[in-house]
């Protein structure tokens, strides 16, 4: 049995998958911050996790997915205020009893050192220094991401 938050996450991902393909993003839009091959948008308002998830979806983006410890550190370096927490795209799957990214993959236990409990209705936030498990109903800021399209050199066949 899926929790309401898991259902929301799956619904949003499916609706995103149904949308027509858009041309690749070569540069970050105005107001988005470039971090390597991603564009990040740090919210200025607060929301529970599922509203944050939905907001990113309306912006044709997703809640932040963090590949590894290195990407976490680089993202945290963009957070100047120690007291501010941001939702990312990771929550606890009750059915699988594991932390699950909104793209369907599971957390590699070595990637993030999470402070707090792994239990139902828990979602992950990051601060300047740490990664926390919070009640998903907690209203905090969030980070949306868009992937930049890598520019590949075109190879032309011999004429």
């Amino acid at each position: 049995q899926k929790s309401s938050i898991e259902k929301c996450s799956v619904d949003i991902q499916q609706s995103r998958n149904k949308t027509t393909e858009r041309p690749g993003l070569l540069n970050c839009p105005i107001y988005w911050q470039q971090l390597r091959e991603k564009c990040l948008l740090f919210s200025h308002t607060v929301n529970p996790w599922n509203n944050s998830l939905a907001d990113c979806s309306t912006k044709e983006s997703s809640l932040l997915l963090i590949r590894d410890k290195d990407e976490l550190i680089h993202t945290q370096n963009l957070i100047r205020d120690k007291a501010i927490l941001f939702w990312i795209g990771l929550n606890f799957s009750l059915s699988e009893k594991n932390w699950k990214w909104i793209n369907g993959s599971f957390l590699n236990s070595n990637d993030l050192e999470i402070r707090g409990d792994a239990k139902e209705n828990s979602c992950i936030s990051i601060s300047q220094t740490s990664v926390y498990s919070e009640y998903c109903s907690t209203e905090i800021r969030w980070i949306c991401q868009k992937e930049l399209t890598p520019v590949r050199n075109k190879v032309y066949p011999d004429s």
């Epitope: 839009p29 105005i30 911050q33 470039q34 200025h44 912006k59 983006s61 100047r80 205020d81 949306c144």
Partner: antibody, heavy 116, light 111 residues
């Protein structure tokens, strides 16, 4: 209530650098975007650029080669430098808080005259 | 650059009567995040600009409900339902789909 106040010299010589500072009170600069806008006497508004509190900037392409905007979060201030000024840079310079395209709080503006 | 064209240049209005200002952009103002960053500002004589409307139709806090915004894509309108003496000034539209640009301004004056 967020308040912004511009400060800096009112007279700058041609070819020199115009330097202005905006002090933010009643709210933290560690959020939102912070913009500079100018208005030549009797004319319309021109956006110069913004800075995000983490230090990333975006400038008007027509001014990009001459503009630098910086931020000092410890002082709740952000600053504008415009190099190689000419008489065409004479304007009232405003600082404003930029909530993604909504310039919701403005300073009173400061007139900068470029003249020898 | 996105060019913002405002009409009319000047709008003489009778107190208590409605006023309407049009703003047209040279290309669509739908940002790649799905929002339309079109705002309206009022500049009273000798004062800095003041935000009235953001994202097409959202009134900023403290703005009287006689001000309303509408439109989509490239065509936008600011309406004042009943003009009051304090509404005299220049009104600007502004886009932020790309680097921000302003319309040339519309002067609202009392007949």
């Amino acid at each position: 209530q967020v308040q912004l106040q511009e400060s800096g010299p009112g007279l700058v010589k041609p070819s020199e650098t115009l330097s202005l500072t905006c002090t933010v009170s009643g709210g933290s600069i560690s959020s939102y975007y912070w913009s500079w806008i100018r208005q030549p006497p009797g004319k319309g508004l021109e956006w110069i650029g913004y800075i995000y509190y983490i230090g990333t900037t975006n400038y008007n392409p027509s001014l990009k080669s001459r503009v630098t905007i910086s931020v000092d979060t410890s002082k709740n201030q952000f600053s504008l430098k415009l190099s190689s000024v000419t008489a065409a840079d004479t304007a009232v310079y405003y600082c404003a808080r930029d909530r993604m395209g909504a310039l919701d709080y403005w300073g009173q503006g400061t007139l900068v005259t470029v003249s020898s | 650059d996105i060019v913002m064209t405002q009409t009319p240049l000047s709008s003489p209005v009778t107190l208590g009567q409605p006023a309407s200002i049009s703003c047209r952009s040279s290309q669509s103002l739908v940002h790649s995040d799905g929002n339309t960053y079109l705002s309206w500002l009022q500049q009273r004589p000798g004062q800095p600009p003041r935000l009235l409307i953001y994202e097409i139709s959202n009134r900023f806090s403290g703005v009287p409900d006689r001000f309303s915004g509408s439109g989509a894509g490239t065509d936008f309108t600011l309406k004042i339902s009943r003009v009051e003496a304090e509404d005299v000034g220049v009104y600007y539209c502004m886009q932020a789909a790309q680097f921000p640009t302003f319309g040339g301004g519309t002067k609202v004056e009392i007949k």
